[in-house]
Interface confidence: low
């Protein structure tokens, strides 16, 4: 019995569902009563899911697996794995027994996009040419381990005096911190690029340092120039700092965070006390750091609706304020590709290829190209629909006349995360049946 699985690993984003494709060719007169199907972990032989005696025996793998019962009789033995975790990565074997027996293994490669790096500078005030500064680039919650590259404003790689550390959290996702020590010139731009080697996703940020003195007043409030980018569901820190004078005490401090446009109060600290969150109880200050001039605000479980500008007001004897922008983002899932019609295709046939990617933010940019990388722009219709959380599902449809054979690729780009998710389908112009989309 010939059992077919994809040669390439199946790549799945953490938290999404993955389909491990497996198919066999049923003979005429085949009935499900004859089928024994077992999915197991290739290395440990741990049972994952089975079908026997004409019945789905259910998941033996944390109740996160399912077959496609309506498709089994057509030879589709694919397995659906829900809410993928880093720990799921590895090889799964599909055993099919009717009268004969066959098996094949499919690899699951788990991935998670890295967040847009945040850049910090130490020291961050009164910089003069010739000073040594430490620039830290931090990117969060990615998998697998990242590759980190530094370069200057002219694109020249900076390799000396770089220290990079990567630490996995309890979910197995990595936080990466890369530190560059550099002696300032008259001015300079320093860029950090965090690459996910599996997703081929590049997340980058840069900082431009112009070490001309900005004369400091009693309260100079400093916030990042660039928007703070936060993934939906994660926590974001809106950085705000001031320079406390000698003898400063928290009793003198009035700190107010508010929405810049509506002036809605978000959080405050007055009369020496944290007055708490006025914003759905999802905000917090850093009380231990306030005396050092750190007035940053932590916003928990970020939602699309949080996007916008927040103003940090600091009053001691004098007064200062500055606004920081929050840009919310969510990565798009790896696109799924469907073909209509999907059987008995001939050169000259017109087919409709649909590329679907889910739950991203903000709206995506969609690009189609052929196997040679030539853009396909004609006969493309793309629609994007926001769900109740404000996340977008994108569906892009390409109508194309088949040549002898061809590859059609769809790339869904998140413009904020600079994350590219792509799917492709190769159609050979001989009579063929496109494998059913599980």
């Amino acid at each position: 019995l010939e059992v077919q699985v994809p040669e390439d690993p199946v790549v799945a984003l953490v938290g999404t569902d993955a389909t491990l494709c497996c198919s066999f060719s049923p003979e005429p007169g085949f009935s499900l009563a004859q089928l024994n199907l077992i999915w197991q972990l290739t290395d440990t032989k741990q049972l994952v899911h089975s079908f026997a005696e004409g019945q789905d025996q259910g998941s033996a793998y944390a109740n996160r697996t399912a077959l496609f019962p309506d498709l089994l009789a057509q030879g589709n033995a694919s397995l659906r794995l829900q809410r993928v975790r880093v720990a799921d990565e590895g090889s799964f074997t599909c055993f099919v027994s009717i009268r004969d027996f066959g098996s094949a293994a499919v690899s699951l490669q788990v991935a998670a996009p890295y967040s847009k790096p945040s850049m910090t500078l130490e020291p961050n005030k009164d910089l003069r040419p010739g000073d040594t500064v430490t620039i830290t680039c931090s990117s969060y919650q990615g998998y697998p381990e990242a590759e980190v590259f530094w370069q200057d404003g002219q694109g020249v790689p900076l390799t000396g005096n770089v220290t990079t550390s990567q630490m996995a959290n309890e979910q197995g996702l990595f936080d990466v911190h890369s530190i560059l020590r550099v002696v300032l010139g008259a001015n300079g731009t320093y860029s950090c690029l965090v690459r996910n080697p599996v997703l081929q996703q590049d997340a980058h940020s840069s900082v431009t340092i112009t070490p001309q003195r900005s004369p400091t007043g009693a309260v100079e409030v400093q916030v990042p120039e660039d928007p703070v980018v936060a993934l939906v569901g994660t926590d974001a820190t809106l950085r705000c700092s001031f320079s406390p004078e000698p003898g400063f005490s928290l009793a003198q401090l009035n700190l107010i965070w508010q929405l810049t446009d509506t002036k809605q109060l978000v959080h405050s600290f007055t009369e020496g006390r944290d007055q708490g969150s006025a914003y759905a109880n999802r905000t917090a200050l850093f009380p231990d750091l306030l005396a050092q001039g750190n007035a940053s605000l932590r916003l928990q479980r970020v939602r699309v609706a949080d996007e916008g500008s927040f103003t940090c007001f600091v009053s001691i004897r004098d007064f200062g304020s500055a606004a920081v922008s929050l840009q919310v983002a969510a990565p798009y899932s790896k696109p799924s590709m469907t073909l209509e019609p999907n059987k008995d295709l001939r050169p000259g046939d017109t087919v409709t290829i649909t590329c679907s990617s889910y739950r991203g933010y903000p709206e995506a940019e969609v690009f189609w190209q052929d196997g040679q990388g030539v853009p396909l722009t004609g006969n493309v219709t793309t629609s994007q629909m926001a769900n109740e959380q404000g996340l977008f599902d994108v569906h892009s449809v390409l109508r194309v006349v088949l040549g002898a054979n061809g590859t059609y690729s769809c790339l869904v780009r998140n413009p904020v995360l600079q994350q590219d998710a792509h799917g492709s389908v190769t159609i050979t112009g001989q009579p063929m049946t496109f494998p059913p989309e599980a």
Partner: antibody, heavy 119, light 112 residues
């Protein structure tokens, strides 16, 4: 060598505007900030503010907010001071002075531009 | 604003004799970074001001070693060990620790 060359003297009527230029040479203009300083007749020096020549951001002392504007043309390494709605009390010598880049001082000064406001 | 007070207003000196000018600030000039941005400028008759001393005690390039600066916190002094005829003019102390930068009212040094 470093030089800051300012435009010539100006005689203006009250309510008019004047634009004083300060052309820098002998160093990279966009590496160091430029300050503006006023000296009224027989009086001391008053710091008016400064402009970041890399980014163009001006900072004004409180007494010079409103009618006074600092600007740049980096293509010709020149800074400008424009004063609008001139008053008699604006009569003074106006100096541009380079920020030294390290010690928060003004290490090189222009020769000064005398602005006289009289009806 | 920080007020800078200089004394004396006028200082007649015989060539070869020492001279001393005092400058007092209304607040400490120690910046939060620990540095003190107190400077001295000289404006010779008919000329633009020129930098003499930066950060309390450092001579600017080309300034003769007969000029020296000292002090801390709010009290500062400029000394000329042996006055020469070319030293005449108005001496200004200036602070750049706090915005706005401010100058003292000036001390006019004259030759007796």
């Amino acid at each position: 060598q470093v030089q800051l060359v300012q435009s010539g003297s100006e005689l203006k009527k009250p309510g008019a505007s004047v634009k004083v230029s300060c052309k820098a040479s002998g160093y990279t203009f966009t590496n160091l900030g430029l300050n503006w300083v006023r000296q009224a007749p027989g009086q001391g020096l008053e710091w008016m503010g400064w402009i970041n020549t890399a980014g163009g951001q001006p900072t004004y002392a409180e007494d010079f907010k409103g009618r006074f504007v600092f600007s740049l043309d980096t293509s010709v390494s020149t800074a400008y001071l424009q004063i609008s709605s001139l008053k008699a009390e604006d009569t003074a010598v106006y100096y541009c002075a380079r920020d030294d880049g390290y010690y928060y001082t003004m290490d090189y000064w222009g020769q000064g531009t005398t602005v006289t406001v009289s009806s | 604003d920080i007020v800078m007070t200089q004394s004396p207003l006028s200082l007649p000196v015989t060539p070869g004799e020492p001279a001393s000018i005092s400058c007092r600030s209304s607040q400490s000039l120690v910046h939060s970074n620990g540095k003190t941005y107190l400077h001295w400028y000289l404006q010779k008759p008919g000329q633009s001001p020129q930098l003499l001393i930066y950060k309390v005690s450092n001579r600017f390039s080309g300034v003769p070693d007969r000029f020296s600066g000292s002090g801390s916190g709010t009290d500062f002094t400029l000394k000329i060990s042996r006055v020469e005829a070319e030293d005449v003019g108005v001496y200004y102390c200036s602070q750049s620790t706090h915005v706005p930068w401010t100058f003292g009212g000036g001390t006019k040094l004259e030759i007796k």
